[in-house]
Amino acid sequence: DADMKGHFDPAKCRYALGMQDRTIPDSDISASSSWSDSTAARHSRLESSDGDGAWCPAGSVFPKEEEYLQVDLQRLHLVALVGTQGRHAGGLGKEFSRSYRLRYSRDGRRWMGWKDRWGQEVISGNEDPEGVVLKDLGPPMVARLVRFYPRADRVMSVCLRVELYGCLWRDGLLSYTAPVGQTMYLSEAVYLNDSTYDGHTVGGLQYGGLGQLADGVVGLDDFRKSQELRVWPGYDYVGWSNHSFSSGYVEMEFEFDRLRAFQAMQVHCNNMHTLGARLPGGVECRFRRGPAMAWEGEPMRHNLGGNLGDPRARAVSVPLGGRVARFLQCRFLFAGPWLLFSEISFISDVVNNSSPALGGTFPPAPWWPPGPPPTNFSSLELEPRGQQPVAKAEGSPTA
């Protein structure tokens, strides 16, 4: 079954998140500075004519681009689009921003710059003060806080009104840790790296972030193909070669926002066995309630059956038995030369009275700081390989 039950559909995650309709209160909108109280952050709501008709920063955004408008969504959301406008001022406003950058945070401390699938950070904005320009964020960002940084190519006044569109991040997944995806060499190179991962990469390990395995995009039967335009072969999948893992498995760790009772994990896998991709032979998961705590009880083991000869990509459901945890560590056993995953999601319920790691207050310092990766993670033997692509210019597979 190729369906990802309990898995969010990014095409349906496009709701206005509350700037225009004021469900985001003024207290959750802030800014680095403003011209005056009449152009304060609270006046930055899309289609609003409050105050002098927009947020306008006091400082120049050229050349430093340090001024920002911040929206606190209070809970983690998947932000799939943003909309911008210039200053209204009863039709007299002339200020708008032709381009801008976005930064986002899940915890209020670590900020990531949004980039498109080809590594471009600058977003085209408005051409006039009144028109609304929507930007489809590919990839979308999982964020609680979003900052808009208006840009200009000379000293000039810029003003912004904004809206964010998306949906609540119900999965509760804060980050996953995994070995860096590898390159498969067929008649052409197939790049199976996690090209939108927003965490850290150290010594062949990615940790502290989210990426393509949690973006809602399910890969095709033929992992060389993608529905995305101008992307390299293998784009939708993250993959690992059996040759690089003497242990016979790939180990991943998942961190969640709060204690949850886990019913199942859904892993969308490729099974194009004529090209070496096979479903995992089995999955083994361990559970713990906190970062420094011991793994609890026996691991959950699940052997995979089904029609392994069927080349269709499919979602594999791994029962997790209602085990309660905030951290999961899962081992995916190789059953062939390659493991290729396009999406991992979880079916879980928040345990009542569990205090959130993210919510009204921010969590304690992250358990894996932006330094060396955890020492208790299985050592990886990664074969040398060429530079992995992060972006692709048209006509070039890796540029």
């Epitope: 095709l220 039967d221 033929d222 193909k225 993608s226 529905q227 194009m272 066995h273 004529t274």
Partner: antibody, heavy 116, light 110 residues
Framework: SVKESGGRLVTPGTPLTLTCTVS????????MSWVRQAPGKGLEWIGT?????GTWDATWARGRFTISRTSTTVDLKITSPTIGDTATYFC??????????????WGPGTLVTISS | ELVLTQTPASVSEPVGGTVTIKCQAS??????LSWYQQKPGQPPKLLIY???NLASGVPSRFKGSGSGTEFTLTISDLECADAATYYC????????????FGGGTEVVVK
């Protein structure tokens, strides 16, 4: 070249197997597909088989057709034909070995008539 | 379910004219689209692959364009030999698909 055979007049419910024979090319290097065309109608994809024997079929064709292959032939079995299965059946070679992509070589087709 | 919708169903143009055939996919298929020409009593013949690439031996009067969900086949300087039915075909996915072909467009050359 690619050539279909086995097309004939049969009564409804009588199983029928069509065979696609390839000459001059290495069949083991390509995915192969069956496509049909009812009189005066458009092209209708039935299914594809790749070099490992993995198959895909049209949603409407499931359970009604079986595709298999040997080192030299690709067969299409119509398990229980109905009058609506009357058509010219084409065998087509894909550009790729592993999945349907596009068809670079077609057979001339074989006519199947289902009539009581 | 991925569906290809071809328009128009039929078009008539004089010799030397230009015909434009559109193929719309119900979801994005990147550039995985091909075009075929079929004449009565013959199998289809590949014209264009990967949305815009001309197949071997096909005259440059045939031009494919588009990406995502909207694709176009343009035939310029029409000749009598171009009278045929033209089909688009998606090559991105064959899972849970009714048909990988569009419904076809008949081109009549006057």
């Amino acid at each position: 070249s690619v050539k279909e055979s086995g097309g004939r007049l049969v009564t409804p419910g009588t199983p029928l197997t069509l065979t696609c024979t390839v000459s001059g090319i290495d069949l083991s290097s390509y995915a192969m597909s069956w496509v049909r065309q009812a009189p005066g109608k458009g092209l209708e994809w039935i299914g594809t088989i790749n070099i490992g024997g993995g198959t895909w079929d049209a949603t409407w064709a499931r359970g009604r057709f079986t595709i298999s292959r040997t080192s030299t032939t690709v067969d299409l079995k119509i398990t229980s034909p109905t009058i609506g299965d009357t058509a010219t059946y084409f065998c087509a070679r894909d550009v790729d070995a592993h999945t349907l992509t596009y068809f670079t070589l077609w057979g001339p087709g074989t006519l199947v008539t289902i009539s009581s | 379910e991925l569906v290809l919708t071809q328009t128009p169903a039929s078009v008539s143009e004089p010799v030397g004219g230009t015909v434009t055939i559109k193929c719309q996919a119900s979801q994005t298929i990147s550039s995985w689209l091909s075009w075929y020409q079929q004449k009565p009593g013959q199998p289809p013949k590949l014209l264009i692959y990967y949305a815009f690439n001309l197949a071997s031996g096909v005259p440059s009067r045939f031009k494919g364009s588009g990406s995502g969900t909207e694709f176009t086949l343009t035939i310029s300087d029409l000749e009598c030999a171009d009278a045929a039915t033209y089909y688009c075909q998606q090559g991105i996915s064959s899972s849970n698909v009714d048909n990988v072909f569009g419904g076809g467009t008949e081109v009549v050359v006057k």
